[in-house]
């Protein structure tokens, strides 16, 4: 089901099909008998009730007010009323650019890093059943793609991919042909300087513990925004109900990187928790770093050289 129109201010291009869907739709279905009204106000006109007789371009269906198509004089405030529920939208209809396949004011900008995953999918769920065909244009030149229902680009970005991509959906309604255009301005940028993530502190840590007690192992790292930090243990035996990973904490560094901390909590320490590796790993597309913790019984600590011991 298409989600409701929650944005209170909407800009659309003249000549395209357009709809407003109110946000108490599920409620309206339950109260079929309730009076539901749509109103428009603009300039001198205050709250004029809308119905299919108001204009041949307007259609009302359940929760939706449709325009076939929307025109410049549709600019104004729209209201939906049902019992004590009211929803309001401010609609601004702008002129179509007759010299281009898209209107500059109705462009969504996206920045994609070179070599990163880049995707454009031409979809329009609301008008899906009415769409005959869809074309994808780059800088107003049609791209020859296999699927003419939902043309898609999926690739790792290259600098040559930069440009304006327009999805144009062609649809029929009451014997007339309409089109809906959605345009993306894609800018390809250099790979934003990523660091190789690093874990802080010694790579091997022996931790003195007592059986039956709890311990918190803290793992800290310097990493990039998209990097991940996690604990790994018990690879051969599956999980241990006494071991819990706490929520990751992050603080931004002045250089725009992240300082992360992730704690592994081991409760009611048993023999099975001793002398096994608890590995904390930080991973990025550029590499990984791992640090290991080994729990040792306090009584056995004399056997371990002081420089590898962590309390």
């Amino acid at each position: 089901a298409e989600s409701c129109t929650s944005r209170p201010h909407i800009t659309v291009v003249e000549g395209e099909p357009f709809y407003l869907k109110h946000c108490s739709c599920s409620l309206a279905h339950e109260i079929e008998t309730t009076t539901k009204s749509w109103y428009k106000s603009s300039g001198s006109q205050e709250h004029v009730e809308l119905n299919p007789r108001s204009s041949s371009r307007i259609a009302l269906h359940d929760c939706v007010l449709e325009f076939w198509p929307v025109e410049l004089n549709d600019t104004g405030s729209y209201f939906f009323q049902m019992k004590n529920y009211t929803q309001k939208w401010k609609l601004n209809v702008i002129r179509r650019n007759k010299h281009s396949c898209f209107t500059e004011r109705q462009v969504t900008s996206k920045i994609v890093e070179v070599k990163k995953f880049f995707q454009i999918t031409c979809e329009n769920s609301y008008y899906q059943t009415l769409v005959n065909s869809t074309s994808l244009y780059k800088n107003c030149k049609k791209l020859l793609l296999e699927n003419n229902k939902n043309p898609t680009i999926k690739k790792n970005a290259e600098f040559e991919d930069q440009g304006y991509y327009s999805c144009v959906h062609f649809l029929h309604h009451n014997g007339k042909l309409f089109n809906i255009t959605k345009t993306f301005n894609i800018t390809i940028v250099e790979d934003r300087s990523n660091i190789v993530p690093v874990l802080l502190g010694p790579k091997l840590n022996h931790v003195a513990v007592e059986l039956g007690k709890n311990v918190r192992l803290n793992c800290s790292a310097l990493l990039n925004e998209e990097d991940v930090i996690y604990w790994m243990f018990g690879e051969e035996n599956g999980s241990d109900p006494n071991i819990h990973e706490e929520k990751e904490m992050r603080i931004m560094t002045p250089e725009g990187k992240w300082h992360a901390s992730k704690v592994l909590r081991i409760e009611n320490i048993g023999e099975s928790n001793l002398n096994v590796l608890y590995n904390c790993t930080v991973a990025s597309t550029g590499g990984t770093d791992t640090k290991s913790f080994i729990l040792v019984r306090k009584a056995d600590m004399a056997d371990i050289p002081g420089h590898v011991f962590t309390r």
């Epitope: 790792n156 991940v228 790994m232 991973a283 597309t285 990984t288 791992t290």
Partner: nanobody, 115 residues
Framework: DVQLQESGGGLVQPGESLRLSCTAS????????MGWYRQAPGKWRELVAR???????HYADSVKGRFTISRDNAKNTVTLQMNTLQFEDSAVYYC?????????WGQGTLVTVSS
């Protein structure tokens, strides 16, 4: 470059199920521990389930008993069966390697749990 393609997300009500699938374009896929990560708005990407090359699964506390991870090395796929979904499970779900350098992230698949 390795491409990861996640699918199967959608809008469900609390208590319902979803099955996510991920395909990797890598011939030695079977050698890697693979995992499902998720990222909710305003949160960090977290590892929720992983499966070793030998097929041993591991789960985060928050999903234990509800999610099941499996893999099909012949098809280069890893799946996540999510049962009894909760509001807190709403996130974009990604698959990737675990324990080694990450492959380039895919676009993920959005899971929304809403009543």
């Amino acid at each position: 470059d390795v491409q990861l393609q996640e699918s199967g997300g959608g809008l469900v009500q609390p208590g319902e199920s979803l099955r996510l699938s991920c395909t990797a374009s890598r011939s030695d896929f079977s050698r890697y521990t693979m995992g499902w990560y998720r990222q909710a708005p305003g949160k960090w990407r977290e590892l929720v389930a992983r499966i070793t090359s030998g097929g041993i699964p591991h789960y985060a506390d928050s999903v234990k008993g509800r999610f099941t991870i499996s893999r099909d090395n012949a098809k280069n796929t890893v799946t996540l069966q999510m049962n009894t979904l909760q509001f807190e499970d709403s996130a974009v779900y990604y698959c990737n390697t675990v324990g080694v350098a990450l492959w380039a992230w895919g676009q993920g698949t959005l899971v929304t749990v809403s009543s």
